[in-house]
């Protein structure tokens, strides 16, 4: 049977707004990723900032509703915004437990949704795990 959706929770220092209210934080201790059990959806999200071929996690958590993309089993980010010159925000939505912990690849910033060779790449069959 399904459990309530559980996602990785992270908010970079200085990030504006918080999604903490969209779930209940689990008491996971210090060495494990922080986890949040979603209150209003069965969907996780992740946001990464790609700057000069270096990806940094900005936010991870629960979405406020189930929307297109939430049916995805894995986190496949697409470019969403350019917060500053030379940097691109990538976001993903996905609908399995802790699916927002990692991404398999980032598409090139210039072509939304198209796989490409730019950006940090994982070897075939591997994933890039964000160090939280």
């Amino acid at each position: 049977p399904p459990n309530r959706r559980t996602c990785v929770f992270f908010e970079a220092p200085g990030v504006r707004g918080s999604t903490k209210t969209l779930g209940e934080l689990l008491d996971t201790g210090t060495e494990l990723p922080r986890a949040i059990r979603c209150l209003y959806s069965r969907c996780c999200f992740g946001i990464w900032n790609l700057t000069q071929d270096r990806a940094q996690v900005e936010m991870q958590g629960c979405r406020d509703s189930d929307e297109p993309g939430c049916e995805s089993l894995h986190c496949d980010p697409s470019p969403r915004a350019h917060p500053s010159p030379g940097s691109t925000l990538f976001t993903c939505s996905c609908g399995t437990d802790f699916c927002n912990a990692n991404y398999s690849h980032l598409p090139p910033p210039g072509s939304p949704g198209t796989p490409g060779s730019q950006g940090p790449q994982a070897a075939p069959g591997e994933s890039i795990w964000m160090a939280l």
Epitope: P1, N3, L32
Partner: antibody
Framework: QVKLLQSGAALVKPGASVKMSCKAS????????VSWVKQSHGKSLEWIGE????????NFNEKFKGKATLTVDKSTSTAYMELRRLTSEDSAIFYC??????WGQGVMVTVSS | DVVLTQTPGSLSVTLGDQASISCRSS???????????LEWYLQKPGQSPQLLIY???NRFSGVPDRFIGSGSGTDFTLKISRVEPEDLGVYYC?????????FGAGTKLELK
């Protein structure tokens, strides 16, 4: 097919600890929560807690915090539960379950001096 | 903690009869995501519990269609349309909407 094979019965002294195992097969171990459930003699069932094998995140019934520790060994697809400072109240059958759809056969723990 | 009250505590039936078990929750079991995490289990004598129904009304794989789950909010029912010998045992309702997850006290289904 999905199977959860639990370790054998245990007779332990009051104040001691016991660690039981639950070996999973027939599915991808890291993709499902493993839950643990207590059944005292002739009584109903109590949910102890659950662990997600991929990253070790666990979620507990407050009643069992400090009593139960949940761990996994991904290399052998095995989940473990350790119970400490045992008393007669801990005498029960303990089940592991794959997110509550498939269940192990149970481990009978008897606490007696 | 959420209390699940099962009635009756025991039920004596004749093979082929319909059986009905009620499970009433002290709080609504509809979660914020719209899903109701209410399940039914059968524990046969000397065996582990086995899942019958999840999400109020979804039969688990291999469960005969004579098992029917229904309800919403705080009131739930498990109906067995024609009781067969292998249906005898203790039935438990269970909720995974609120922490800690909790079970009902059980309903024993036995022969008259």
């Amino acid at each position: 097919q999905v199977k959860l094979l639990q370790s054998g019965a245990a007779l332990v002294k009051p104040g001691a600890s016991v660690k039981m195992s639950c070996k999973a097969s027939g599915y991808t171990f890291t993709d499902y929560w493993v839950s643990w459930v207590k059944q005292s003699h002739g009584k109903s069932l109590e949910w102890i807690g659950e662990i997600y094998p991929k990253n070790g995140v666990s979620n507990f019934n407050e009643k069992f915090k400090g009593k139960a520790t949940l761990t996994v060994d991904k290399s052998t697809s095995t989940a473990y539960m350790e119970l400490r400072r045992l008393t007669s109240e801990d005498s029960a059958i303990f089940y592991c379950t794959r997110q509550r759809d498939y269940w192990g056969q149970g481990v009978m723990v008897t606490v007696s001096s | 903690d959420v209390v699940l009250t099962q009635t009756p505590g025991s039920l004596s039936v004749t093979l082929g009869d319909q059986a009905s078990i009620s499970c009433r929750s002290s709080q609504s079991l509809e979660y914020g995501d719209g899903y109701t995490y209410l399940e039914w289990y059968l524990q046969k004598p000397g065996q582990s519990p086995q899942l019958l129904i999840y999400g109020v009304s979804n039969r688990f794989s291999g469960v005969p269609d004579r098992f029917i789950g229904s309800g919403s909010g705080t009131d739930f029912t498990l109906k067995i349309s024609r009781v067969e010998p292998e249906d005898l045992g203790v039935y438990y309702c269970f909720q995974a909407t609120h922490d800690p997850n909790t079970f009902g006290a059980g309903t024993k289904l036995e022969l008259k």
